[in-house]
Interface confidence: low
């Protein structure tokens, strides 16, 4: 019998054979970390000769070559050093910005052993566009330098690099780029489990939160987050069992899928799990139409019963057919429930494809994905209703381009991954949904539908009042703590007489809570600068109230996200190593940042927070206020960097009774408190008939209206001191 020659050693590396030296055997080379094999494999042909994929000569000497990371092709508005053609493992590249530009992302990045850079893309931005500068990832070339609403940018990779992510992105109305950041990578690169787990977990946790974001803690479940039963998730697990997957690897695919199922059910959401194994043909082991797909024991049992031999007669990889069976399942369910019914339209769908290679039969899997997107009516408004995760395992035959094409593209998220081996896959699934640290409620979820009540839109909003009239507003930042302004308490009233009114679905007037403890910033003293001719000074205007009981989370009562916390990090879908500075750069990333506060009547009003140069011109106006500040020489004596400034152009101004309320912004359909209402130069409710009417300041008013809000990014030490046990803070 013919066999292939055995002189196939690789210097510095090892090899394995799938079927010995016989024809049809696949020889796979591997190298130590930091090196990659060239060629990666050889196939023993029936002629008894080794064939190297894409080789020009019949047999090239196999070698382990050093992994290198791609060099920047261009870096706008700044410089990078050192300037090399590519970078060795362990090598650094540093970025600096020209004057007037702020560096976002990582100032120094290191080339890692998998051929990927650590950190985030460095961008020099001046905040001038409607969307932030999307940057240019290392090894990429971008065309398009306008960042206004509707503008598009396109990316391509230099030389032989492969693009993953979105080749084209559009600046959307909400100031966010469509799709996901494009990354140029070496064809031989792969992902480390420790990178994939948080990326996958962040995206998945967000989807679980969206499925019905009303979490509460449950000690008996080992403090796992529980999501109330309302939304529904269909999870489709697609396991490749083609010939190239060894039986052992198939077992690990199954185990990883079991881990996933176990985690998903621990969220206690309404979930149905479909299980499909595929090679040349798909085999549906569990359908979402089967009532058992909602039962963890049945799902796990059908996974356990999946046999490697089920596909021994058809050994190709028909990813199209596997995805098409998901489409057919969806179609059947839609017909069953009715296309226009909420029952159908409110189901979220997640597909996890575990494969070891490119599809080699059945046509383009992208066609099936397009059909799925169509049947689910996926568009900008319904983007959250479908997530496709494409996970390639084993570096040999995995096609980056195909995985990237199949995976969803969402800003700040990754859905396509290549892992080195099934062991790495197992690690990922073990760690991807580790939410044990997040023992608090999901934050920053407001009902954005047209028919929601004001309180449902801003469920964190509370009213703080003494026994008599209403005085201040505040925001729930956990189920027992309220953030508000210190000046609400400046008369030193006994706080036991005060009440905090929190939203309650059962009553349009809300529910009253007593205050167990008031923590007022010791630095606040309205008369601190009286001898400097500053009649009122609002530095350190911040206070925390601990309610006498915990608030029951509902559609009407839910905390807002505080930046610089893990809870907010999850909501922003940022990577795990993010810092407080990253949050500030992401949330206050323009010279004029659209934000909101809540009016006395509960409606959401619009303001623009002025940053950078615009902050200076916004604050400058205070020097015209001669009544409160008769002989002011330096505006910064009154408006310190603790304050955010608004009130220009079409901004609404808060009224006196709205002090202490959250100044917040929306990102990714979640809400984040960046400030709290403190003081201003104009009270629009003065002299108006009722709480629903506000009087705009006449255009001729001197000084023009300006409003100042305590900047929570500047109050971090104090917040951490008092909330360290309540929230999970990120490093500064």
């Amino acid at each position: 019998a013919t066999s292939c020659p055995q002189n196939v050693n690789i210097s510095g590396g090892t090899f394995t054979l799938s079927h010995g030296w016989a024809p049809g055997s696949l020889l796979i080379y591997s190298c130590p970390q930091g090196l990659y094999p060239s060629p990666a494999s050889r196939l023993c042909k029936s002629s008894g000769q080794w064939q190297t994929p894409r080789a020009t000569r019949s047999l090239t000497k196999a070698v382990c070559k050093p992994v290198r990371c791609p060099a920047p092709v261009s870096f706008e508005n700044g410089i990078y050093t050192p300037r090399l053609g590519s970078y060795p493992v362990g090598g650094n590249v540093s970025f600096e910005c020209e004057d007037g530009f702020i560096l976002r992302g990582s100032p120094v990045r290191q080339c890692r052993p998998n051929g990927m850079w650590d950190g985030e893309t460095a961008v020099c931005d001046n905040g001038a566009g409607h969307c932030p500068n999307p940057g240019i990832s290392l090894g990429a070339v971008r065309t398009g330098s306008r960042f206004g609403h509707g503008d598009k940018v396109r990316y391509r990779c230099s030389s032989n690099l492969v693009l993953t992510g979105s080749a084209e992105r559009e600046c959307q109305g909400n100031g966010v780029w469509s799709g996901t950041e494009p990354i140029c990578r070496q064809p031989y690169s792969y992902d480390f489990p420790e990178d994939v787990a948080p990326a996958l977990g962040t995206s998945f946790s967000h989807m679980l939160g969206a499925t019905n974001p009303t979490q509460r803690t449950k000690e008996s479940l080992g403090r796992k987050i529980q999501i109330q039963r309302s939304g529904h998730l269909n999870l489709y697990l697609l396991l490749d069992s083609s010939q190239s997957v060894s039986e052992n690897d198939f077992l690990i695919f199954k185990e990883s899928a079991s881990l996933m199922v176990d985690r998903i059910f621990s969220f206690e959401i309404n979930v149905s799990v479909a299980i499909i194994t595929f090679a040349s043909e798909p085999k549906v082991l569990m359908s979402v139409l089967n009532v058992n797909s909602r039962d963890i024991t049945e799902v796990i049992s059908s996974l356990e019963n999946a046999k490697y031999k089920d596909h021994e007669n058809g050994t190709g990889t028909n990813t199209y057919a596997a995805l098409n069976s998901v489409y057919l399942m969806m179609n059947n369910q839609m017909q069953l429930l009715g296309m226009k019914t909420m029952a159908w339209q409110e189901i979220r769908h997640a597909i996890i494809l575990l494969t070891d290679g490119k599809s080699n039969m059945g046509g383009s899997p992208k066609t099936a994905v397009d059909q799925i997107r169509e049947i689910l009516n996926i568009n900008q408004k319904r983007n959250d209703y479908l997530d496709i995760y494409a996970i390639g395992v084993g570096k040999l035959d995995v096609d980056w381009r195909e995985l990237n094409e199949l995976g969803s593209k969402k800003d700040g998220e990754r859905h396509a991954f290549i892992l080195q081996d099934t062991k790495a896959l197992h690690q990922v699934f073990e760690h991807m949904l580790d939410v044990s640290k997040l023992t608090d409620t999901i934050c920053g979820v407001g009902n954005m539908s047209a028919n929601a009540s004001d309180q449902e839109r801003t469920p964190w909003h509370v009213t703080i009042k003494p026994k008599s009239q209403e005085t201040c507003r505040g925001a729930l930042i956990s189920d027992q703590w309220v953030l508000t302004a210190a000046h609400c308490f400046r008369d030193g009233n006994d706080h036991s007489l005060w009440r905090v009114n929190v939203g309650d679905p059962k009553s349009q007037w809300g529910k009253e809570f007593l205050i167990e403890k008031a923590v007022i910033s010791p630095g606040f003293d309205v008369f601190a600068k009286k001898n400097q001719g500053i009649l009122e000074f609002y530095g350190d205007d911040i206070a925390l109230l601990k309610l006498a009981q915990k608030v029951k989370m509902s559609t009407h009562a839910r905390p807002i996200c505080l930046p610089c916390t893990m809870e907010a990090n999850l909501a922003l879908r940022r990577p795990q190593g993010s810092t407080c500075r990253d949050h500030e750069n992401e949330l206050l990333n323009k010279q004029s940042v659209p934000a909101h506060f809540v009016a006395l009547n509960g409606s959401k009003l619009n303001i623009n927070l002025k940053m950078g140069v615009e902050w200076t011109s916004c604050a400058e106006v205070v020097s015209q206020e001669k009544t409160m500040f008769p002989n002011l020489t330096d505006v910064r004596e009154v408006v310190t960097d603790q304050f955010l400034c608004s009130g220009t152009q079409e901004d609404e101004s808060p009224c006196k009774g709205e002090s202490g309320g959250a100044v917040f912004l929306e990102r990714r359909f979640r809400f984040f408190q960046v400030g709290l209402v403190s003081w201003g130069l104009y009270n629009p409710c003065l002299g108006s008939a009722d709480k629903n009417s506000r009087k705009r300041a006449p255009r001729s008013k001197v000084p023009p209206p300006r409003d100042f809000h305590i900047n929570l990014f500047r109050m971090q030490p104090w917040l951490r001191q008092h909330l360290g046990d309540v929230l999970n803070f990120l490093p500064l």
């Epitope: 296309m339 226009k340 049947i375 047209a450």
Partner: antibody, heavy 119, light 107 residues
């Protein structure tokens, strides 16, 4: 550019049926819903129903539930509206209109098909 | 069944601001669209989602919706704006149109 081209005018006797076609072009046929709206002479607009070109599922206005059938042929990107048991008050211009999701409105309309029901 | 009520007609001189109202029970809780229809032509969408303008619609067209009333406002009305205007919303998966308002721009 987006075009919805409807079939020509029809004259029908009471009790008969009419089938109006609407050929779509210039966009991804299965991404948008298709609606039918009619307008009697000198009167306002009246919604008849919706069809989803991707799956072919339909929802009809209560008033037409028993008499209307909407279908589609994805291969020719054409939708059809058939109205049976015609009566004189069905004399109207029948429009097909394209829409994204409900709240986005009907952003492109066909030129209209006049159906006259007369004995 | 849900009903939308519009005034049958509104008249004004060129350059003035036209306001056409559309009322329905708790209409502010629903999205409203507005259509313009000139004699012998198909309707044209001028406002969707209460206040958004499709591309190609002049800035003088604006919309608002709160309480029980949606309003289409045409500022600096021109002779070419003379047409019938229909409001439309959705009620339990059914589209509902108002009776229409004839806008006349006086010579």
């Amino acid at each position: 550019q987006v075009q919805l081209v409807q079939s020509g005018a029809e004259v029908k006797k009471p009790g008969a049926s009419v089938k109006v076609s609407c050929k779509a072009s210039g966009y991804s046929f299965t991404t948008y819903y298709m609606y039918w709206v009619r307008q009697a002479p000198g009167q306002g607009l009246e919604w008849m129903g919706i069809i989803t070109p991707s799956g072919g599922s339909t929802t009809y206005a209560q008033k037409f539930q028993d008499r209307v059938t909407m279908t589609r042929d994805a291969s020719t990107t054409t939708v059809y509206m058939e109205l049976s048991s015609l009566r004189s008050e069905d004399t109207a211009v029948y429009y097909c209109a394209r829409g994204y999701e409900g709240s986005y409105g009907f952003d492109h309309w066909g030129q209209g098909t006049l159906v006259t029901v007369s004995s | 069944s849900y009903e939308l009520t519009q005034p049958p007609s509104v008249s004004l001189s060129p350059g003035q601001t036209a306001s056409i109202t559309c009322s329905g029970d708790k209409l502010g809780n629903k999205y409203t669209c507005w259509y313009q229809q000139k004699p012998g032509q198909s309707p044209v969408l001028v406002i969707y989602q209460d206040n958004k303008r499709p591309s190609g619609i002049p800035e003088r067209f604006s919309g608002s919706n709160s309480g029980n009333t949606a309003t289409l406002t045409i500022s600096g009305t021109q002779a070419m704006d003379e047409a019938d205007y229909y409001c439309q919303t959705w009620d339990s998966s059914t589209a509902v149109f108002g009776g229409g308002t004839k806008l006349t721009v006086l010579g």
